[in-house]
């Protein structure tokens, strides 16, 4: 922590400017008035302060705003944002997309994923929902950031906004997030024709249930292997060999390459070897001929 000293008269600060570049940490602590700093935050980003000096300036703001910074200060944090922890950001109330844009720009190229995720969360809370303007801002300034939001926050996305989401924005989404987004996407694209619908829904299919995947297998969509590999394990396991063959079309040959990887490996274990052999791919590990399959989970439920 910076030691407290009194400010020498000749070092008193009346405005935030270049003259502060060479102040020592204890001089900044003693001589910079926190209210002046807050009022002139827009100037800080143009001054080549060192890491240590920025620590002092952050400390002064923390003392002035223990409950969290006001948005007028947050908007002008600039490089000082790089000093913020997720705990700091959780105290903020942010509603302006200009503020979000400014801070996303600053964070580019820095390891700030936790802070950015928290910031986006605060924006969604502040604005009440994940509206189209927010999604547009995220896709433009922070591809992949949509997936930093919790499933709870994503549940506030209106289906009408889903069209603004690009495939690359969903690359880092986990199954729980796709579980939330998929039904919204299904609703958003329901009036599209078969092929157009598949192109649109494809990035969201990691959240699709078995019945929807089965339905797709009847539509000659020729699903690529990458999309198939992202399907929920639970959605793939009940599919028959015939359904998978129809679903993948010419891409079915790719199953051999993915034979050892989930969900393909798990799916193979559930199929009769006879049925797998009909694909002519040499897939091994299916249930041998003549074996009886007992579903123990059903028996336990009955007892």
């Amino acid at each position: 922590d910076v030691e407290r000293t009194t400010c020498p008269p000749e070092k008193e600060v009346h405005e935030i400017d270049e003259s502060l570049i060479f102040y020592k940490k204890r001089e900044l602590e003693a001589c910079v008035d926190a209210a002046l700093l807050a009022a002139q935050m827009d100037r800080v980003d143009a001054i080549p302060f060192t890491y240590e000096q920025l620590d002092v300036l952050k400390h002064k703001l923390d003392e002035l705003y223990p409950q969290g910074y006001p948005e007028s200060v947050i908007r002008h944090l600039g490089h000082l944002f790089l000093k913020m922890s997720p705990e700091d950001i959780r105290k903020w109330n942010v509603t302006s997309l200009e503020t979000l844009k400014a801070l996303l720009k600053v964070s580019k190229g820095h390891e700030m994923s936790a802070q950015v995720a928290t910031l986006i969360d605060r924006v969604v809370v502040g604005r009440g929902q994940l509206d189209k303007d927010t999604v547009d801002t995220l896709t433009a300034f922070c591809p992949g950031c949509l997936c930093s939001l919790s499933p709870e926050r994503l549940s506030s996305v209106p289906p009408s906004v889903i069209g603004a989401v690009r495939p690359q924005d969903l690359d880092t989404c986990g199954p729980r997030q796709l579980d939330v987004l998929y039904p919204k996407a299904r609703l958003a694209f329901q009036n599209m024709s078969g092929s157009e619908y598949f192109v649109k829904i494809r990035p969201f299919l990691g959240g699709a249930p078995t019945e929807d995947v089965k339905a797709l297998s009847q539509q000659n969509v020729s699903m690529d292997l990458a999309t198939f590999m992202k399907l929920r394990r639970e959605a793939v396991l009940p599919l028959t060999v015939a359904e998978v063959q129809k679903l993948l079309g010419p891409h079915v040959e790719g199953l051999k390459v993915e034979e050892q990887h989930s969900p393909v490996r798990d799916w193979i274990l559930k199929q009769r070897q006879d049925d797998l052999d009909t694909l002519g791919l040499g897939l091994q590990g299916g249930i041998p001929n003549g074996y009886l399959i007992l579903d123990l989970s059903v028996r336990e439920a009955l007892s």
Epitope: E18, I21, F22, D45, P48, E52
Partner: antibody
């Protein structure tokens, strides 16, 4: 070991520009500000300006505003100074010098780059 | 800007002799830094924050002062100390250097 390796001597014509480099090694380039200092033939030293390599923010001596432009390339840990509209007054040795921790003077200096302006 | 005046401009000392050079500031400064420069080489940080010796600087060197008056002292001159010494402040913007004191060996 810390090193600030400056580019070689320059002989330039009046009115021209020159860009000199300062390649650093042995420390985290973005953690310390880089200063530039002018020394005219054996005379005293003049501070030109400072750049924060992490953010690219700069501070200049009023006397050198418009004359010097400071930049950095983080990928190569190199600082640059461009001098414009050169006159004989700009003939000097120019040093890059790392700013010490918490304002503790300029702790490491480059070997200097001699710039001679002559027609 | 603050003007730093060093005196004397040139001085000479015999080996073993005590040497003191001064740096006077036109306005009060909080710290003074000193650099040593030998002919044809770049300056080296020598004393910083008024009295702290830089790494590798012999203990015969010391710095002191406050306000507008600062000094560098060598308790016992040695031949390797012959050089030009510059004082520098960055308490006030922009940073400035003194004109230098050239120390020669007798």
């Amino acid at each position: 070991e810390f090193q600030l390796q400056q580019s070689g001597p320059e002989l330039v014509k009046p009115g021209a520009s020159v860009k000199i480099s300062c390649k650093t090694s042995g420390y985290s380039f973005t953690d310390y500000n880089m200063n530039w200092v002018k020394q005219s033939n054996g005379k005293s030293l003049e501070w030109i300006g400072v750049i924060n390599p992490n953010y690219g923010t700069t501070g200049y001596n009023q006397k050198f505003k418009g004359k010097a432009t400071l930049t950095v390339d983080q990928s190569s840990s190199t600082a640059y100074m461009q001098l414009n509209s050169l006159t004989s007054e700009d003939s000097a040795v120019y040093y890059c010098a790392r700013g010490g921790y918490d304002g503790e003077a300029m702790d490491y200096w480059g070997h200097g780059t001699s710039v001679t302006v002559s027609s | 800007q603050i003007v730093l005046t060093q005196s004397p401009a040139i001085m000479s000392a015999s080996p073993g002799e005590k040497v003191t050079m001064t740096c006077s500031a036109s306005s009060s400064v909080n710290y003074m830094h000193w650099y040593q420069q030998k002919s044809g080489t770049s300056p080296k940080r020598w004393i910083y924050d008024t009295s702290k010796l830089a790494s590798g600087v012999p203990a015969r060197f010391s710095g002191s002062g406050s306000g507008t008056s600062y000094s560098l002292t060598i308790s016992s001159m040695e031949a390797e100390d012959a050089a030009t010494y510059y004082c520098q402040q960055w308490s006030s913007y922009p940073p400035t250097f003194g004109g230098g004191t050239k120390l020669e060996i007798k």
